[in-house]
């Protein structure tokens, strides 16, 4: 059909993780598809096997070195196959050519910790993870905290417009549970997009000192 | 969105050769993937080839793979369709598409424009 609903989505993580998402509708679930990766200026290929991640849609990263190693540039173009079988032999049903650094998204920022909490304030930092050393410092950053009585989606988000891996959260309840959770973006890249949530971080406020507000 | 202007159709006899090219306007061209696909009569549109922004990447129907070959050239804006070994099941409307800004190109298409077409007619 014209005007298909395929789909197929790929990021790279900065260092040496590109991942990828193909979807199709009316694809049978145990349709066996694999990603290739065929760089222009790098003597490497790689391919990784799509597993379903949904009804319609099929997950792969293609690992391209260890975790921290810096495999790819912004003048590199990788170009990336869906290649699914078909009987005895393989179908290519999509091609892209890919500029690493035009999509972006970073791992989720790690190792959350609660630096110094009081009654109605919590300095909490944290750290990024597997994040290109060509950034430098040009990074942002969006947080959320988990009221009380409140979802995720309720929680106002803060936004950080410089690499700095720490907040104060002000004007919180005395001895109250809350969560926290933040995300990172680079500035660079026209598809870029932001990080997943990291692992909430929880914690509780102290409570006020007897006689006093 | 981008224009596109086809043309290099005609009548060919079977086995012969033709390039159809597709001229696009539109400052996004060097990014889009490109398509092509034809029409025969009182037949659904159907794919044919397509080429990725950059041109190291081709995808073609494997009624036409061997024989067609797509390419382009950025520089001018300009899609082509080499088409040889030509046969008479290949006579149709061929039409010239520009898929999503960024994307990848799909076999089933996924496009944003779409030419006028040019008329390709092979006689036995």
């Known amino acids: 059909a014209v005007n298909g609903t395929s789909r197929f989505t790929c990021f790279y993580n900065s260092r040496a993780n590109i991942s990828c998402v193909w979807s199709q509708d009316g694809a049978l679930q145990d349709t066996s598809c694999q990603v290739h990766a065929w760089p222009d200026r790098r003597r490497w290929n790689q391919t990784c096997e799509l597993l379903p991640v949904s009804q319609a849609s099929w997950a792969c990263n293609l690992i391209l070195g260890t975790p921290d190693s810096q495999k790819l540039t912004a003048v590199d173009i990788v170009t990336l196959r869906v290649m699914c079988r078909e009987g005895v032999r393989w179908r290519m049903m999509a091609i892209q050519d890919f500029k690493p650094f035009e999509n972006l998204r970073l791992m989720a920022p790690i190792s959350l910790q609660v630096v110094h909490v009081e009654t109605h304030r919590c300095n909490i930092s944290w750290k990024i993870s597997q994040a290109s050393h060509y950034f430098e410092r040009h990074l942002e950053f969006e947080a959320r905290t988990l009221s009380p009585g409140h979802t995720w989606e309720e929680a106002p988000l803060m936004t950080l417009k410089q690499k700095q891996e720490w907040i104060c959260l002000e004007t919180l309840t005395p001895d109250t549970q809350y969560e926290f959770q933040v995300r990172v973006k680079p500035l660079q890249g026209e598809f870029t997009t932001w990080s997943p949530w990291s692992q909430p971080l929880a914690f509780r406020t102290k409570p006020a000192a007897l006689g006093k507000d | 969105e981008v224009q596109l202007v086809e043309s290099g159709g005609g009548l060919v006899q079977a086995g012969g050769s033709l390039r159809l090219s597709c001229a696009a306007s539109g400052s996004t061209f060097s990014r889009q993937p490109m398509y092509w696909f034809r029409q025969a009569p009182g037949k659904e549109r159907e794919f044919v080839a397509a080429i990725t922004w950059s041109g190291r990447g081709t995808l073609y129907a494997d009624s036409v793979e061997g024989r067609f070959t797509i390419s382009r050239d950025n520089a001018k804006n300009t899609v082509y369709l080499q088409m040889n070994s030509l046969r008479p099941d290949d006579t149709a409307a061929y039409y010239c598409?520009?898929?999503?800004?960024?994307?990848?190109?799909?076999?089933?298409?996924?496009?944003?424009?779409w030419g006028q077409g040019t008329q390709v007619t092979v006689s036995s």
């Open positions: 598409a520009a898929g999503p800004y960024g994307d990848a190109a799909y076999r089933h298409g996924r496009i944003d424009s």
